[in-house]
Amino acid sequence: SEVEYRAEVGQNAYLPCFYTPAAPGNLVPVCWGKGACPVFECGNVVLRTDERDVNYWTSRYWLNGDFRKGDVSLTIENVTLADSGIYCCRIQIPGIMNDEKFNLKLVIKPAKVTPAPTRQRDFTAAFPRMLTTRGHGPAETQTLGSLPDINLTQISTLANELRDSRLANDLRDSGATIRIG
């Protein structure tokens, strides 16, 4: 079954996918698609890379990490409920039936209503690197400690996002990274 990731309406969603290039700059084509991975490539492609660069993308979908180092995690900007569903990350390793495919389930939750009349900030827009935090514990504490004046609802939302980010890191650290070569 698919690994599940969550985001709220209006935020940026993060879907992790990694591989380790055999050598620096020795990239492998990758595609991201909406829908489970089919036999070849991706269905309803939203982003594609080749051996050198991102060669196809659609609005709101981008790679926030360093894809030249194998971080091909997908960021979806300003999500709506319609963005819910399964996404396919396919790492097209050359050879006979060598493709690695990952189905990731994105669940979009309605945005929380914030009753406080304080100035609102879109966290993922203000802190776009927040969801790509790699470290555990101290790095996350430091991220929380460096936040500007925000309300409790936003802190709660941030904590949830960091929890989901930690899940992504745990997945990566538990062997979801594909090594090539």
Epitope: V39, F40, E41, C42, G43, V45, Q92, P94, G95, D99
Partner: antibody
């Protein structure tokens, strides 16, 4: 006009080899996945093998991958299927087909097919 | 492997009839299903892909539906040129697999 023309079929003895070719024209060959599908006399369709745009990724029916090799020459617009250690059960019409494709789609279904070439394996 | 089971295996109908061919997958294939038409001595022709999208140039009397494990191809009003063999094909799991075919004959 898109055209796929297979050749190389014929009568071969069990254990023999054949190389099928599929000459493509009317489209940018290097932009498309290509596939071989076969059909035994009076039977249904069976997928054999597929190859990606640049030939770096290949896919086979498990039971055939030790004997069959798919390849392509994008400079000549030709798709190949090398068949070794042929058996009677490999007797079929072999079709080459183009994987439907545009940016944003996946090439998992086949929009153009050749006329087929008959391979008969018999002693 | 994902097994594709078509029914019926053969069907007799008349010009003007509405006919439906079904295809069942042995596991969930989402909407990754294609329908082909093949006439005797000819190569297959793409009719419908992604379960319900009509291929270019295919008459609107053809329609596809379904998702998951149950799919169907409907011809709303049979024409003489529609008498042929029909195959479904899944493109979710490796290997690609086809149904055994449905032979549509003139009654």
């Amino acid at each position: 006009e898109v055209q796929l023309v297979e050749s190389g079929g014929g009568l071969v003895k069990p254990g023999g080899s054949l190389r099928l070719s599929c000459a493509a024209s009317g489209f940018t060959f290097s932009d498309y996945y290509m596939t071989w599908v076969r059909q035994a006399p009076g039977k249904g369709l069976e997928w054999v093998s597929s190859i990606n745009y640049d030939g770096r990724n290949t896919y086979y029916l498990d039971s055939l991958k030790s004997r069959f090799t798919i390849s392509r020459d994008n400079a000549k617009n030709i798709l190949y299927l090398q068949m070794n250690s042929l058996r009677a059960e490999d007797t079929a019409v072999y079709y080459c087909a183009r994987g439907y494709y545009y940016y944003g789609s996946s090439p998992n279904y086949f929009d153009y097919w050749g006329q087929g070439t008959l391979v008969t394996v018999s002693s | 492997d994902i097994q594709m089971t078509q029914s019926p295996s053969s069907l007799s109908a008349s010009v003007g009839d509405r006919v439906t061919i079904t295809c069942r997958a042995s596991e969930n294939i989402y909407s990754y299903l294609t329908w082909y038409q093949q006439k005797p001595g000819k190569s297959p022709k793409l009719l419908v892909y992604n379960a319900k999208t009509l291929a270019e140039g295919v008459p609107s009397r053809f329609s596809g539906s379904g998702s998951g494990t149950q799919f169907s191809l409907t011809i709303s009003s049979l024409q003489p040129e529609d008498f042929a063999n029909y195959y479904c094909q899944q493109h979710y799991g490796t290997p690609l697999t086809f149904g055994q075919g449905t032979k549509l004959e003139i009654k």
